[in-house]
């Protein structure tokens, strides 16, 4: 978790002098509770936006927006703590809006936005906006949270971001798999424009079951430049096991930008349809 271009952070708006600060996610009001605290944020909204760094890289960011409730507690609002928790790693990053002037009611509802938390593809985050000072123990909560799931690199808009392109999102191998005679599979896919090796991982399963009955790995050496964007054809020999008929073929590239952590593509061959076996006709008729 990180912030995008930390130097450009602003939270001031007409009628409010405000500064954005790094936060330890442990505001002072936790340790020294105040008697009077503001109410919670209203209408927390999170959207996926895309922002360029000064170097020209494109990153997905969480666009966080919320409004204030129209009550008197606005007079005791000193700022807000924005927290983003990445759920699979428990990593948390916070920033603090520090109000340098008192808020006053005006003709329209106060609205705040922040779009500098960089998020990763296919990750889930808990986004929380806490009004400051935080409530006294057993006081009414004055925060709002939402769990936000970021699309993966298959998503059309995510595909062109820097983290996705670095993991090989622009490569479309267009995998085809066909079953040949004599327990063989022909795998065909389009090579990318990089002289790097590939690995084909074959996993076979029985019909309607999820434990594998055969696994095989096939190494494909790095193509020469004249082979870039050409089709690569590989024939894999299967184990002759009756019922081991559903095959998953996964292609793992080793691009220089992502090494052994590149996006993998896969294709599946289903078991052949079994023809309905007709009821056997008895060769004698019972007499009763």
């Amino acid at each position: 978790l990180r912030l995008l271009d930390h130097r450009a952070l602003v939270c001031s708006q007409p009628g409010l002098n405000c500064t954005v600060k790094n936060s330890t996610c442990l505001d002072d009001s936790w340790i020294h509770p105040r008697n009077l605290t503001p109410s919670s944020p209203k209408d927390l909204q999170i959207q996926l936006h895309f922002a360029h760094t000064q170097q020209g890289d494109l990153f997905p960011v969480a666009h966080i927006e919320w409004t204030l409730q129209t009550d008197a507690s606005i007079l005791y609002l000193e700022g807000a703590e924005l927290s983003v928790l990445q759920l699979n790693t428990n990593e948390r990053l916070c920033v603090r809006f520090e109000f340098l002037s008192k808020l006053r009611h005006h003709h329209r509802r106060w609205r705040f936005t922040f779009s500098h938390f960089v998020v990763d593809p296919d990750q889930e985050y808990e986004v929380t906006v806490h009004h400051l000072p935080k409530p006294i123990p057993d006081g009414d909560p004055n925060h709002q949270s939402k769990n936000f799931l970021v699309p993966d690199c298959e998503h059309a808009r995510m595909k062109v971001t820097t983290p996705c392109m670095s993991s090989g999102s622009l490569w479309d191998p267009n995998i085809t798999v066909e079953t040949l005679e004599a327990h063989q599979l022909r795998v065909s896919f389009t090579l990318w424009n990089e002289s790097t090796h590939y690995q084909i991982l074959l996993t076979s399963f029985p019909h309607m079951e999820n434990h594998s009955c055969f696994e095989h790995m096939h190494h494909i050496p790095a193509p020469r430049p004249e082979e870039f964007h050409q089709r690569s054809n590989v024939t894999l020999t299967l184990r002759n096991l009756k019922g081991c008929c559903r095959h998953q073929v996964q292609i793992q590239p080793f691009f220089s930008s992502c090494l052994n952590d590149c996006l993998r593509h896969s294709a599946t061959v289903s078991c052949p349809e079994m023809p309905d076996t007709p009821e056997p006709i008895p060769d004698y008729m019972p007499l009763w």
Epitope: Q47, N147, F148, L149, P151, A156
Partner: nanobody, 126 residues
């Protein structure tokens, strides 16, 4: 322009099933999370279920968990709601709604729903 058209509603007996469909047009369907929202007679709006852009993540209101299944077919620009074990309290006007922003939030919309269908009426009665 964006259009969401629901179908599949009707009168059904308690315990029976119904499948709602929503045909979408006028936007890149597979960019956005989609949702079902309902409004019972004389009541407010209630979020029912949501599904992420590729169908990989689904979420349901507690009142329908285990009975309703949301799905989508991006090739057909369509959203579905399979409703099983229907109860009289499921009687409502069911709306298909598009999330305004990219991404997906559990328990409802990340931002606002910016487009809604006209609704399809589901009546559960014996």
């Amino acid at each position: 322009q964006v259009q969401l058209v629901e179908s599949g509603g009707g009168l059904v007996q308690p315990g029976r099933s119904l499948r709602l469909s929503c045909a979408a047009s006028g936007f890149t369907f597979d960019d956005y999370a989609m949702h079902w929202v309902r409004q019972a007679p004389g009541k407010g709006l209630e979020w029912v279920s949501g599904i992420s852009w590729n169908g990989g993540t689904k979420d349901y209101a507690d009142s329908v968990k285990g009975r309703f299944t949301i799905s989508r077919d991006n090739a057909k620009n369509s959203l579905y709601l399979q409703m099983n074990s229907l109860r009289p309290e499921d009687t409502a006007l069911y709306y298909c709604a598009k999330d305004q922003g990219l991404g997906f939030c559990r328990g409802g919309s990340c931002s606002h729903f910016d487009y809604w269908g006209q609704g399809t009426l589901v009546t559960v009665s014996s």
